[in-house]
Amino acid sequence: SSPCPQAWGPPGVQYGQPGRSVKLCCPGVTAGDPVSWFRDGEPKLLQGPDSGLGHELVLAQADSTDEGTYICQTLDGALGGTVTLQLGYPPARPVVSCQAADYENFSCTWSPSQISGLPTRYLTSYRKKTVLGADSQRRSPSTGPWPCPQDPLGAARCVVHGAEFWSQYRINVTEVNPLGASTRLLDVSLQSILRPDPPQGLRVESVPGYPRRLRASWTYPASWPCQPHFLLKFRLQYRPAQHPAWSTVEPAGLEEVITDAVAGLPHAVRVSARDFLDAGTWSTWSPEAWGTPSTGTIPKEIPAWGQLHTQPEVEPQVDSPAPPRPSLQPHPRLLDHRDSVEQVAVLA
């Protein structure tokens, strides 16, 4: 059997660190057998069998010129083996961040904080943390560890499925190369890393007869689980074309009627989502949708002020991307105190 321990990595390759002493091991001999060492393709003897180092070649303060293939020969001239030297560095702790687009799953991504120059792999696992005692604020890793399954195709990402929203987790990402291993531990709670995907299906429509109105509607992101326990709240921004500043409102449901649009101008509208109890952060903005208020054709019958009524929010259908959820509030009223100027203009 070979006297050379096989480091993790391709066979026949041995590893060292620049600036450090490196020992190369002749693989095809018995431990301690004296051998001669040569650089591949060069006749010059690097180290003879009388060195007293047996089957090893010692390179003091290795540098990049020492990288390459070495040949070892036994006393009778037989080939003891070939060894390729590759220089690099031990792993440093990877940089890890985790994110969740819903309240049941989260993913963690990582990057090396320093390139080692050597073959590298990553081991990923997680534990669930629990409180040590009723009167203790300390937390300790308790259950697990479980593997955090990595994406195929080599993407630096692993996903934890079926996480508990109220629990804390400790993520372990270990960078491994032939010179060692280095671990980054990251404590995460789903509540703090929750960031929904942006709302989908944003539509902006004019409201016939009202030249300062636009109705925007949207649906829950498809990635949000279809259960009513965790709702989303929304933030809507709108602005007329060529206008630099956004106006912001927080709609009550999946629809908002803008009542102070600029007549005749196209408006950009976008929406963002967040857990309704303010866990985590707001999503990124949805792609902008555009709409232009109607030109103000008067409805055939304008109801008297006292006869206006609100329409209850329509429950989404079962196959709708939005989950069934309680209606938080009726649709915004078709007219409110901001509309009197517009109404006069329409009636004039």
Epitope: V95, S97, S111, S113, Q114
Partner: antibody, heavy 118, light 107 residues
């Protein structure tokens, strides 16, 4: 020679923007994370932001999050810090530093002074 | 964020004296602690890393010790060129933090 050289500092009004650069030489820039650290006049050191070798992960101090952006161009061996919405409290000498293992800063530049004042 | 405290904030000592600075972290930092020296108008210089390892080229009169949350930096025999401010710094997490510094001068 192994060194870092910052540039781009100067006087800017509150609310203004500035872009700092850090030119690296003498080491394999693309192998290392890089960092910005600042020091207000007469005060201590404050970590500002770091970026991994690939640029794929960045980290910011809460005091600059959303206003500053760290980036790098490995082909030019250069680190950048884009500073927007500057405030008086951002006045400091800004140092570029090379960390080992993300946070052990074994190489520093000389620093560039940023003054935010009206 | 992990808070770092240092004491004393300043000290005066004679040449040849043994000088000790302490640093405390608000939580366990797993020995990911560094010490820097900064002279007026200059960039900081790494002296000690990972609590007790001497950075290459740094004189052996500088040393560090400690673990968990409590750390000590020592100059065994103060020299005139050691007049500077000394900072501890943790890097256990992804947001490194520095102590407020200790200013050392000669009596």
């Amino acid at each position: 020679e192994v060194q870092l050289l910052e540039s781009g500092g100067g006087l800017v009004q509150p609310g203004g923007s500035l872009r700092l650069s850090c030119a690296a030489s003498g080491f394999t820039f693309s192998w290392y994370s890089m960092t910005w650290v600042r020091q207000a006049p007469g005060k201590g050191l404050e970590w500002v932001s770091s970026i991994v070798p690939s640029g794929g992960h960045t980290q910011y101090a809460d005091s600059v999050k959303g206003r500053f952006t760290i980036s790098r161009d490995n082909s030019k061996n250069t680190l950048y810090l884009q500073m927007n919405s500057l405030r008086a409290e951002d006045t400091a000498v800004y140092y570029c530093a090379k960390p080992v293992d993300w946070g052990r800063f074994d190489l520093w530049g000389r620093g560039t002074l940023v003054t935010v004042s009206s | 964020d992990i808070q770092m405290t240092q004491s004393p904030s300043s000290l005066s000592a004679s040449v040849g004296d043994r000088v000790t600075i302490t640093c405390q972290a608000s939580q366990d930092i797993n020995n990911y602690l560094n010490w820097y020296q900064q002279k007026p108008g200059k960039a900081p210089k790494l002296l000690i890393y990972d609590a007790s390892n001497l950075q290459t080229g740094v004189p052996s009169r500088f040393s560090g010790s400690g673990s968990g949350t409590d750390f000590t930096f020592t100059i065994s025999s103060l020299q005139p060129e050691d007049i500077a401010t000394y900072y501890c710094q943790q890097y256990d997490n992804l947001s490194p933090t520095f102590g407020p510094g200790t200013k050392v001068d000669i009596k």
